[in-house]
């Protein structure tokens, strides 16, 4: 028989973790697993338990994680990778809306994330969404155009900046920007 099905790996409460704040990584396989292996990729680091409690987030713990489990002599497929990001490593960027934060339905608006530092990567988050705002192909960028705005675009946005050299060490979040669709 083939490999066992992959487990799930999640970060609670979030995979975006402010420095010095706690986070729990949880690997979930089927009942009765003999052994779990949680590993930090591109490093030599691991643990043989399903749950990793990080009492205070540090730069050294940011990175990509995955887990697998063993039943008898069989190992499972690895979980999907989890990207654990340390935030608050750098000063917050500023987030603005052009031409402004109030936009008519059907209109266009561009959210711009700016930083004083030479960061080449940016991520935009909308409160309540599980993942960053993405444009096709390129989603880390200083400008995020929203074409043909709808009511679904209204809400609270924040952006982060970081460097591609250290992709898991992010700035503090920008001050929130409230986008109002009229």
């Amino acid at each position: 028989s083939g490999p066992l099905p992959k487990p799930s790996l999640q970060a609670l409460p979030s995979s975006l973790v402010p420095l010095e704040k706690p986070v729990t990584l949880r690997c979930q396989g089927p009942p009765g697993v003999d052994l779990y292996r949680l590993e930090k990729l591109s490093s030599s680091r691991y643990q043989d338990q399903a749950v990793l409690f990080i009492p205070a987030m540090k730069r050294s713990l940011a990175g990509r994680y995955r887990c697998s489990y063993q039943n008898g002599s069989l190992w499972s497929l690895p979980s999907d990778q989890l990207e654990l990001v340390a935030t608050g490593v750098f000063a917050k960027p500023s987030l603005s809306a052009q031409p402004g934060p109030a936009v008519s339905s059907g209109g266009d608006v561009t959210l711009q994330c700016q930083t004083r530092y030479g960061f080449d990567q940016f991520a935009l988050y909308k409160e309540g969404d599980p993942a960053p705002y993405k444009n096709p192909e390129r989603w880390y960028r200083a400008s995020f155009p929203i074409i043909t705005v709808t009511a679904a675009h209204s809400g609270t946005y924040r952006c982060y900046s970081f460097s591609s050299r250290d992709p898991y060490l992010w700035s503090a979040p920008s001050d929130p920007l409230e986008l109002v669709v009229t």
């Epitope: 930090k40 030599s44 680091r45 691991y46 643990q47 409690f53 050294s60 713990l61």
Partner: nanobody, 127 residues
Framework: QVQLQESGGGLVQAGGSLRLSCAAS????????MGWFRQAPGKEREFVAA????????YYADSVKGRFTISRGNAKNTVYLQMNSLKPEDTAVYYC????????????????????WGQGTQVTVSS
């Protein structure tokens, strides 16, 4: 919040002894290894000694072997460094560090990563 608090530093004459303590406080603290490092003025921080919680294996820098002993307390959150036959070149700020995750490297390897660090305690050895 995790805190590593060193104590036991001070001024001692060459040939004397000191015992450093490191206590880890904070929420449910677990660790693969705890280690001691030191930094002398104008020099880089260097590894001194480490102990793995699982099995209690110990590791030492060549410069302190036979003189320093690392041990753990009854509680899993305390580690000690007994320093005997101290020399003036042992003068430095001594830091306690701990690693949350296991590693394929031993704790004295340059690629071994420590996550939590104390503020340090000064050890001065006079001649």
């Amino acid at each position: 919040q995790v805190q590593l608090q060193e104590s036991g530093g001070g001024l001692v004459q060459a040939g004397g002894s000191l015992r450093l303590s490191c206590a880890a406080s904070g929420r449910t603290f677990s660790s693969d290894a705890m280690g001691w490092f030191r930094q002398a003025p104008g020099k880089e921080r260097e590894f001194v000694a480490a102990i793995r919680w699982s099995g209690g294996s110990t590791y030492y820098a060549d410069s302190v072997k036979g003189r320093f002993t690392i041990s753990r307390g009854n509680a899993k959150n305390t580690v000690y460094l007994q320093m005997n036959s101290l020399k003036p070149e042992d003068t430095a700020v001594y830091y306690c560090a701990s690693s949350l995750l296991n590693s394929y490297y031993p704790p004295d390897h340059t690629s071994y990563e420590y996550d939590y660090w104390g503020q340090g305690t000064q050890v001065t050895v006079s001649s």
